[in-house]
Structure formats: C-alpha cells, structure tokens
Interface confidence: medium
C-alpha cells in the first residue's frame, strides 16, 4: 500500500532538481574565477540539508545558514540592482552592464532561480508531487525562506547608490508584499546606503505618464526616507531603447530621454 503523502497546493520539486543545482554550481564556478574555491558537493549537501527530512511548513533561516556560509560571495556593494516583478529585463540589463549584479547573478541566486523544492518530514525523499504554496499553505516553506534569507543578505550588503527596477505596467508598481517591499527595502543599511534609485519601466509604447508620481512610488519614497536613505526615481519610457543604449552609449539617439 503506498504511503500517505501530504498534498500541497503548489507545484512539486522541479524535476532533476539535484542534477540542476549541481550543474549550475559547476557552471557558475567555471564562469566566475573568484568562486573556483567552492566545493559544489558541499554546496549541494548544505542545500539538501536545509530542507530534507524537515516539515516543509516549518523551515527557518537557520536551516539555510550552512548553505549561506558556503555561498559567501563579495559583490561590489555599490553595483547592486534590485528588482520587483520585472526579473527578465533586470537580468538582460546585468548581462549587458556586466559590472552590475542582481541577486540571481550571485552563486546562491543563480543556483535556485526559477526552481521549486521541498522535502517531507522524517523521510529523506524529495517531494516531486507538490510543495506548499506561500498563500494557500504556509509562508515558512523551503523556497520562500530561501529567497527571504538570500534577499535579506543581499540587501544588507548594498552600499552607496542602490538601484531597483520596478514594473510600471502593474497596478501596484511598488508592492509592499513583494520580496523587494517586504524584505530588501527594510534591510538596506542607512549607514552604508546613501540613495535608492528606482527605475520605473513603462510597458506601453505611447505611455508618457510620469509614473514616479504613482501613489505606490510615493509610499516607497516615504518608507525609504523614514529609514534615512535618500530616494530618487526615473521613468524608463522605452525599455528596448534603454537596453540598446546601455549596449551602445555612444549612439546619437541615446542622448534623448529613454
């Protein structure tokens, strides 16, 4: 008789999860010479140890500490790009502007990007059928706790001017419940961070509104100002042109507003 298994509301662990994490670790350490010392076997063991045999609604940041320690990485603290609900453009940007970094450009972010994982209490099995959904099941699930942990550490490391890319097409351009709004904003260190500069990305070709005046952006400005950090905001009216101008800043069309 098959053993009873908890049914969660979210999708199960990504297929070939161990292989994917290990292959990504190898690839990352090959591409980034400064991370060549990393032992990917130990990284996988620490990753696995964070959630295997544990109840997937009872995961803590403490569970991920061995992994955090192994994945310790120094990125230039003044070259950090945060993002909310606009991951693809943020990643396209850092692929071109190679000296800036999103969380997914770091080892730990790269390992887990777009993956889902969870285990089962008291068994060494990975659950490929279902995993807890943040809203419908529980917030202390392996994936949510991982991203909360790495996002907090990433924000804590930032200094000088920190940039954040926000999606101007969404009803809430700044969402207090996003990882950026609930974790990163509150973990920027006022002693180190002088300014948070928001880049609001417009979706429509003909959208000429000043989205920096949006009520949610004003809310972000208020939160940031109360934390003793300056705030600035820019509209990116033409994201395609914006990327093009990052690639070719000498282009004559790049002197006008983008």
């Amino acid at each position: 008789v098959p053993r009873w298994r908890q049914q969660w509301s979210g999708p199960g662990t990504t297929k070939r999860f161990p292989e994917t994490v290990l292959a990504r670790c190898v690839k990352y350490t090959e591409i980034h010479p400064e991370m060549r010392h990393v032992d990917c076997q130990s990284v996988w063991d620490a990753f696995k140890g964070a959630f295997i045999s544990k109840h997937p609604c009872n995961i803590t940041e403490e569970d991920y500490q061995p992994l955090m320690k192994l994945g310790t990485q120094t990125v230039p603290c003044n070259k950090i790009l945060l993002w909310s609900r606009i991951k693809d453009l943020a990643h396209q940007f850092t692929q071109v502007q190679r000296d800036m970094f999103t969380l997914e450009d770091t080892l730990l972010g790269y390992l887990a990007d777009d993956l889902t994982w969870c285990g089962e209490f008291n068994t060494s099995k990975i659950n490929y059928q279902s995993c807890p959904d943040w809203r419908k099941d529980c917030s202390n699930n392996p994936v949510s706790v991982f991203w909360k942990t790495v996002s907090r550490r990433f924000a804590e490391a930032a200094c000088d001017v920190v940039h954040v890319m926000l999606n101007g097409s969404r009803s809430k351009i700044f969402d207090k419940n996003s990882t950026f709004g609930s974790v990163e904003v509150h973990n920027l260190q006022p002693e180190k961070v002088q300014t948070l500069e928001a880049w609001v990305i417009h979706g429509g070709r003909e959208d000429s509104r000043d989205l920096c005046q949006d009520p949610t952006i004003k809310e972000l400005e208020s939160i940031i100002s109360k934390r003793n950090i300056q705030f600035s905001c820019k509209n990116i009216y033409r994201p395609d042109k914006f990327l093009q101008c990052v690639k070719n800043p000498e282009d004559s069309s790049c002197t006008s507003e983008i």
Partner: antibody
C-alpha cells in the same frame, strides 16, 4: 572506489574519425564534469574540452573547435570524445578525467588512457 | 589563451634533497592552479589544487605556493618514487592549459 575505464587502442587513417569512450563506475556520473586531455608521444598534456553529463553542456579548446565532439550518455554512465579529420599529429594518448567534488578545473580521477595512432 | 611556462625543463636532484619547481602564467590565474605528477606509461596524478591544497592521499612533503602569475611546487625531501615529470595547470580561464612539464631525475 570511483573509476574511469576507457576503450581500447585504435589505429586510424588520416582524414577519418575516432570515437573514444570513458565509462564511469562507483559514483553519480551525471553530475561530475568529464574533461578530455591528450598527450602526444614524448610531449606534454593538452586539455581538449569538457562535458557536464546532466545538461550536455560542453566547452572546447579553440584549437579543437569544429573537430572535436564531447558527449555523455547518462543511461550508461559513459562519456565520449570524437575527433574528426584526423592527421598524423593527432597520434596521442587520450585521457578522460574527472574533477573532484563535481568540479572540472582540477582533475582528480583519470582514465587509463587510450592510444590513438593515425597512420596511412 | 594563458601560456604556462615551467622551469627548469629538467631538474637533477639526489634522493633526500629538496626540489623546487617553478611555474609562471602569462597572466594572472589567481589561485586557480593545480600540479600533477606523471610517471612513464601512467596517467597523471593530482598533487595540489587551489595552488596550495594537497589532494587526498598526497604526502606532506609536497607543498604548493604562489598566486597570480608565479607558482612553486616544493618536494621537501625527495624519495625514489618522486622521480617523474611534473605539470602545472591553470583553470582560471578557458581553455584550461598545462605547462610543458619539469622532469625530476636522479642526480
């Protein structure tokens, strides 16, 4: 005990191709990176390229680009190195090697080598 | 491509003596350097990785040092089984490249 066992010696004509196999035992094959290194008689070691079996990702030295194909078959835990358009200078011992702890940079475990002789 | 240059090409040493082998990279490879030992008719054997970390089972008489472009492999007291060819290899940049080797022979 992890081992890499390679196929036997080959004698080939110039212009033909050779495919050398490397079977892994005693470890989780798919997540270890397999590199190929060759050594001409009396000469030094030359890195040719590598494969990550779980993804099929490859990387080749420029010198061999277009002539070498490195593949892996997870079902049989075997990696392959195929070299085409053979010339006499390709006469060498070909080694497969594996990194320590999933890593490909330093090569901790080596196959016994396969001698490929190219002669008309 | 990073060129690795080893010196000397041949080193004649008496058993019990110290041997010092050098390896120079044409550009910085940080600490991403390995050393191998190869005996005739055998596959290479990993001695050192990360410029200074001894591989599993390698005797303490083998030590590596250096970073950037200059590296050294030291064998503190040569045993008869240490007479072989030694290669350095960088894994900082594609393609990984080896030095041409240093032959350590009995004086």
């Amino acid at each position: 005990q992890v081992q890499l066992v390679q196929s036997g010696a080959e004698v080939k004509k110039p212009g033909s191709s050779v495919k050398v196999s490397c079977k892994a035992s005693g470890g989780e094959f798919s997540i270890y990176v397999i590199s190929w290194v060759r050594q001409a008689p009396g000469q030094g070691l030359e890195w040719m390229g590598r494969v990550i079996p779980s993804t099929g990702d490859t990387n080749y030295a420029q010198k061999f680009q277009g002539r070498v194909t490195i593949t892996a078959d997870e079902s049989t835990s075997t990696a392959y190195m195929e070299l085409s358009s053979l010339r006499s200078e390709d006469t060498a011992v070909y080694y497969c090697a594996r990194g320590k702890a999933y890593y490909s940079g330093w090569l901790a475990i080596w196959g016994q080598g396969t001698l490929v002789t190219v002669s008309s | 491509e990073i060129v690795m240059t080893q010196s000397p090409a041949t080193l004649s040493v008496s058993p019990g003596e110290r041997a010092t082998l050098s390896c120079r990279a044409s550009q910085s490879v940080s600490s991403n350097l390995a050393w191998y030992q190869q005996k005739p008719g055998q596959a290479p054997r990993l001695l050192i990785y990360g410029a200074s970390t001894r591989a599993t089972g390698i005797p303490a008489r083998f030590s590596g040092s250096g970073s950037g472009t200059e590296f050294t492999l030291t064998i503190s007291s040569l045993q008869s089984e240490d007479f072989a060819v030694y290669y350095c290899q960088q894994y900082n940049n594609w393609p990984w490249t080896f030095g041409q080797g240093t032959k350590v022979e009995i004086k």
